[in-house]
Interface confidence: low
């Protein structure tokens, strides 16, 4: 006589909410005579899931006809799975006895876990911009997944990052889980066009990870380099003062011209040229009529970039001795 084996082939069953779950159980022998019952959990607190002989189990159906004499398949299907259905299910053989049947052998159990996809990762950057060589933090969040095992990776322009910290909550058993990861990124001057990506891999995604991205352009401020030059015009009594603002990001930039401390013009950067690295250049000029000047002129250009403190660059326009003489004569 062959020894009875209770075969539950699946160790783990992943099921989505609302789906049906098939719990497989076959026996290798018809002996001893007696029923097969299904339980969730073990020990005295176990929960009866299905008993063919008695009870009312509207969500449970048998896969094969248990009334057939030589039936060896005791698999069941549970419909409309809810989060409360998670647990380990055992098919248990009882030997017919009097007055009660006696437990004879249990299958190894099938763990039913809720299968839920993680939400699309959302990546958020720092609240304020930072300048190159500073470190900024990006946070990636995804929620609603089950089981708990999940893999999260960070990339910058396709290159994997290593400086990040990840937490999966809650720590204990739950219907679903959420993940939060914070990556630290050191900014470089050319990062205006860079991108950070958070990649989440989970068993429910069948090898096709979810990604969330953020542009470093939202997190970086590249301060401008300033250069001022002067060129005499052909007419001889005019000087063109050119002010070049280079390699800045973002665009919002305001420039104020001051002549001997008095504002003579305010401009907001408009026609910009874009560099390959995503930064901008802008040129502004001022024509100064030197024939009107009696004394040296201090020309100051004040640049306010992205709400930061203004940066000043001054130039002294020296008026020739000949002009000074002429203008002093004119005042007499």
């Amino acid at each position: 006589e062959e020894e009875l084996q209770m075969i539950q082939p699946e160790k783990l069953l992943l099921v989505a909410v609302g789906e049906s779950a098939t719990l497989n159980c076959t026996v290798t022998s018809l002996l001893p005579v007696g029923p097969v019952l299904w339980f969730r959990g073990v020990g005295p607190g176990r929960e009866l899931i299905y008993n063919q002989k008695e009870g009312h189990f509207p969500r449970v159906t048998t896969v094969s006809d248990l009334t057939k004499r030589n039936n060896m398949d005791f698999s069941i299907r549970i419909s409309s799975i809810t989060p409360a259905d998670a647990g380990t299910y055992y098919c248990v053989k009882f030997r017919k006895g009097s007055p009660e049947n006696v437990e004879f052998k249990s299958g190894p159990g099938t763990e039913m876990a809720l299968r839920a996809k993680p939400s699309a990762p959302v990546v958020s950057g720092p609240a304020a911009r930072a300048t190159p060589e500073h470190t900024v933090s990006f946070t990636c969040k995804s929620h609603g997944f089950s089981p708990r095992d999940i893999t999260l990776k960070w990339f910058k322009n396709g290159n994997e990052l290593s400086d990040f910290q990840t937490n999966v909550d809650p720590a204990g058993q739950s219907v679903s889980y959420s993940i939060r990861s914070t990556a630290r990124v050191v900014l470089a001057p050319w990062d205006v066009r860079s991108q950070v990506t958070c990649e989440v891999a989970h068993v429910t995604l069948q090898g096709d990870p979810l990604r969330g991205t953020a542009n470093l352009s939202e997190a970086i401020r590249v301060p401008p380099t300033l250069e001022v030059t002067q060129q005499p015009m052909r007419a001889g009594n005019q000087v063109n003062i050119t002010y070049q603002v280079r390699n800045f990001y973002p665009q919002n930039l305001q420039l104020t011209w001051l002549e001997n401390g008095n504002v003579c013009r305010t401009e907001t950067a408009s026609t910009l040229t874009e560099n390959k690295d995503g930064t901008y250049n802008w040129t502004s000029w001022l024509l100064v009529n030197t024939s009107d000047q009696r004394d040296d002129v201090v020309l100051t250009c004040q640049v306010k970039h992205d709400g930061q403190l203004a940066v000043n660059k001054s130039l002294v326009l020296e008026v020739s001795a000949h002009q000074k003489d002429q203008s002093s004569d004119a005042t007499h």
Epitope: R40, G41, P44, G45, R46, E47, L48, I49, Y50, G55, H56, F57, P58, R59, V60, T61, I78, S79, S80, P83, A84, D85, A86, G87, G172, Q173, S174, V175
Partner: antibody, heavy 120, light 111 residues
Framework: QVQLVQSGAEVKKPGASVKVSCKAS????????INWVRQAPGQGLEWMGI????????YYAQKFQGRVTMTRDTSTSTVYMELSSLRSEDTAVYYC?????????????WGQGTLVTVSS | DIVMTQSPLSLPVTPGEPASISCRSS???????????LDWYLQKPGQSPQLLIY???SRASGVPDRFSGSGSGTDFTLKISRVEAEDVGVYYC????????FGQGTRLEIK
């Protein structure tokens, strides 16, 4: 026989939290789910959520998500329902009720109810 | 959520006479497994609710056979063949196909 015995009446201020207990006896604690249902004065019944004492998992009605927490202590066969950020509309009798998910799912046994009054 | 609507909201009955309460759901409560996920509860004055009927038509243990449940899909009825004084209270239908929701209740009183 099956019994669900709940904790006594509570008076709370708006913004506070309340924790109601439900002690089960007369059956194997982990074989029944515990539901929480509330009833505002003179009103109908409103389902809040379900706690599975076997695995500890919970499932809350959308209306209460973020405010309700259901926990269990298997050593004392007790289930707890905590409701936070209380407002005057939360004044109600809170009932625990057991159900057997695979049997028929109906709420076959009920606690005696706990009156929670929210008032400033 | 599934909305449950009961009628009438008040039901005065003479003892010994039959009574009938209707419950309508906003969507079908008939599951593909053949069962209607509808229960009936009675809340007697000053007491907790008690289960009368589950899965549309199955009487809970200890419930007198004068109570019966019928219907399928979206329309259900609770019938009391001969009302007794102890049947006074509020009757609720509840759907359990999705997140449970209750009807607004029908108050049965003795004439």
């Amino acid at each position: 026989q099956v019994q669900l015995v709940q904790s006594g009446a509570e008076v709370k201020k708006p913004g506070a939290s309340v924790k109601v207990s439900c002690k089960a006896s007369g059956y194997t604690f982990t074989s029944h789910d515990i539901n929480w249902v509330r009833q505002a004065p003179g009103q109908g019944l409103e389902w809040m959520g379900i706690s599975n004492p076997s695995g500890g998992s919970t499932y809350y009605a959308q209306k209460f998500q973020g405010r309700v927490t259901m926990t269990r202590d298997t050593s004392t066969s007790t289930v707890y329902m905590e409701l936070s950020s209380l407002r005057s509309e939360d004044t109600a009798v809170y009932y625990c009720a057991s159900s057997r998910r695979y049997w028929n799912g109906a709420f076959d046994y009920w606690g005696q109810g706990t009156l929670v009054t929210v008032s400033s | 959520d599934i909305v449950m609507t009961q009628s009438p909201l008040s039901l005065p009955v003479t003892p010994g006479e039959p009574a009938s309460i209707s419950c309508r759901s906003s969507q079908s409560l008939l599951h593909s497994n053949g069962y209607n996920y509808l229960d009936w509860y009675l809340q007697k004055p000053g007491q907790s609710p008690q289960l009368l009927i589950y899965l549309g038509s199955s009487r809970a243990s200890g419930v007198p056979d004068r109570f019966s449940g019928s219907g399928s899909g979206t329309d259900f009825t609770l019938k009391i063949s001969r009302v007794e004084a102890e049947d006074v209270g509020v009757y609720y239908c509840m759907q359990a196909l999705q997140t449970p929701t209750f009807g607004q209740g029908t108050r049965l009183e003795i004439k």
